[in-house]
């Protein structure tokens, strides 16, 4: 964990970043500079060296393991995304299948995000319906896995093998909705070609009984009408943003460097005129061939 | 960070143009600039949304339609404009940053605004 | 155009206490809705999008739920800090009906 991480000391890493600044720059022998940089520094705080920490006997303080382990289980506290894309389910003819206690949804969402986006985290949302005898006052206890059904290659195309996304467990009083996340597949989807992607939710029993009256029944609200719909949520981060300040920052240090390049007329900080636009016509490819489905 | 300019004290049936400045970020495709007013001692009222990339789509609320106008002049701002002004326009009008939101079928929207400049007052008064 | 109905306007808790708040859409946005925390003279905070999704640096104290029309923002653990207003805003797209945004009222919470 980055919290138990405490042998190397906050000056060294700091020394470390100076390290990628100076290390190619001709002429300036890096080692000596950072050197006298580290003694000057020692000096002003009337110290000889780095004082050295034991790791062993250093315990990173309760409030920080609480506020690391806050964000490494709180999937609420995400980064901020600035770019919010919604699917949903486009298969609105499939019926569940029910056999032994177990029901199978199949999902389909057609899925497009421009490769200069970073997926910062995806999330399917699963209305949960709760369907129960009212004098029960006992809640609907199941295992939901949602599965990915992967495209069959070669020969076996009868076969559909299934890769396992995320399972959890679900103790359910009311119909609510149940978010799970599926960033990994998301940024796998995204470096595919492919748009088109299935999944599987699977409902179980928990205890291995059949579902009946008393135990009541908990299934996923699929109806294609319904504001219950399963939704596809994608939180990403414009990067080409980013991309451009760099190539920005490469053109004016590459101008400093070779002065005859300004003769050529070069403006640095014009945008190429087609990313946006080819993102939208790829958009409204997308579109013309899904409008049909919805319709 | 954003920040309105503009704000005054003005008699009713003049027009106002309201600036809003975008520092710290420069404008691009991936987000929305909207506009929204409060008068003093209510709530908030949506009034308008423009598209920081390249093309000049906006968003009006339908009792906005007509008297005010919002537009990319020069990056980084984003001007409201404002006709016919009455005693109800008097507010503190801000800028707002709206998240990127696209649908699964390519259509994309301002959604939740996640960065609000600090204000500016308009009165009108005669 | 949608109207967001809020409630209550006001509502007094203790230090440590729970706040709800409902907010009912005249029609249904799925799960296209904020809640935003205002305190006087400031402009408006985001703290909660997509109905339940907690924007960044927001504590978890704050939880949004709910979809179609009936949204609920969830204050728990009440801190004197968290005396403000706070709105709910619909921001719903339809390629039928186009794009439309809307507040509502707001309700004041006081912290005893």
């Known amino acids: 964990s980055p919290i138990m991480n405490l042998e190397q000391s906050p000056l060294e890493e700091d020394m470390s970043l100076f390290g990628d600044v100076f290390s190619e720059q001709d002429g300036v022998d890096f080692n000596t500079l950072l050197q006298s940089m580290k003694d000057e520094f020692l000096k002003t705080l009337n110290l000889s060296d780095i004082p050295t920490q034991d790791s062993a006997k250093v315990d990173p303080p309760e409030y920080m393991l609480e506020l690391y382990n806050k964000f490494a289980t709180d999937r609420t506290s995400m980064p901020s995304a600035n770019i919010i894309r919604s699917f949903k389910n486009e298969d609105l003819f499939s019926q569940p299948v029910s056999f032994n206690g177990l029901r199978k949804y199949p999902l389909l969402f057609n899925v497009s995000i421009p490769h200069h986006e970073e997926v910062i985290m995806a999330e399917l949302r699963l209305y949960t319906l709760v369907q129960r005898d009212r004098m029960i006052y006992d809640g609907v206890d199941r295992k939901i896995t949602i599965f990915e059904v992967l495209e069959s290659k070669g020969d076996n195309e009868g076969e559909r093998n299934m890769l396992v996304l995320v399972s959890g467990e679900i103790y359910g009083t009311n119909s609510e909705w149940e978010t799970f996340d599926v960033t990994d597949a998301i940024r796998r989807w995204q470096k595919s070609g492919s748009s088109t992607h299935q999944l599987e939710v699977h409902i179980e029993s928990k205890h291995d009984e059949a579902e009946d009256a008393s135990s009541g029944r908990l299934e996923i609200d699929t109806s294609a009408q319904n504001k219950h719909n399963p939704l596809l949520i994608v939180f990403s981060d414009d990067q080409s943003s980013d991309k451009e300040r760099k190539e920005e920052l490469n053109e004016m240090i590459s101008h400093e460097q070779l002065p005859e390049l300004d003769n050529l007329g070069l403006d640095s900080f014009s945008s190429g005129p087609g990313e946006e636009a080819l993102l939208q016509m790829r958009s409204n490819i997308i579109y013309d061939s899904t409008a049909r489905i919805r319709r | 960070s954003l920040e309105e300019s503009g704000g005054d004290l003005v008699k009713p049936g003049a027009s106002l143009t309201l600036t809003c400045t975008a520092s710290?970020?420069?404008?691009?495709?991936?987000?929305?600039i909207c506009w929204v007013r409060q008068a003093p001692g209510k709530g908030l009222e949506w009034i308008a949304c423009i598209y920081a990339g390249s093309s000049d789509i906006t968003y009006y609320a339908s009792w906005a339609k007509g008297r005010f106008t919002v537009s990319k002049t020069s990056s980084p701002t984003v001007t409201l404009q404002m006709t016919s002004l009455t005693a109800a326009d008097t507010a503190t009008y801000f800028c707002?940053?709206?998240?990127?939101?696209?649908?699964?079928?390519?259509?994309?929207?301002?959604?939740?605004?996640?960065?609000w400049g600090p204000g500016t007052l308009v009165t009108v008064s005669s | 155009d949608i109207v967001m109905t809020q409630t209550p306007a006001s509502v007094e808790a203790a230090v440590g206490g729970t706040v709800t708040i409902k907010c009912q859409a005249s029609?249904?946005?799925?799960?296209?809705l904020a809640w935003y925390q205002q305190k006087s003279g400031q402009p408006p905070k985001l703290l909660i999008y997509?109905?339940?999704t907690l924007e960044s640096g927001v504590p978890s104290r704050f939880k949004g739920s709910g979809s179609g029309t009936e949204f609920t923002l969830t204050i728990s653990d009440l801190e004197c800090a968290d005396a403000a207003t706070y709105y709910c805003?619909?921001?719903?797209?339809?390629?039928?009906?186009?794009?439309?945004?809307?507040f509502g009222g707001g309700t004041e919470v006081v912290v005893k």
């Open positions: 805003q619909s921001y719903y797209y339809s390629s039928s009906s186009s794009y439309g945004s809307a």
């Open positions: 707002a940053r709206g998240r990127y939101y696209v649908d699964g079928y390519a259509d994309y929207y301002p959604g939740d605004f996640n960065l």
């Open positions: 029609q249904s946005i799925s799960s296209y």
């Open positions: 710290g970020f420069s404008f691009s495709s991936s987000y929305w």
């Open positions: 997509l109905a339940s």
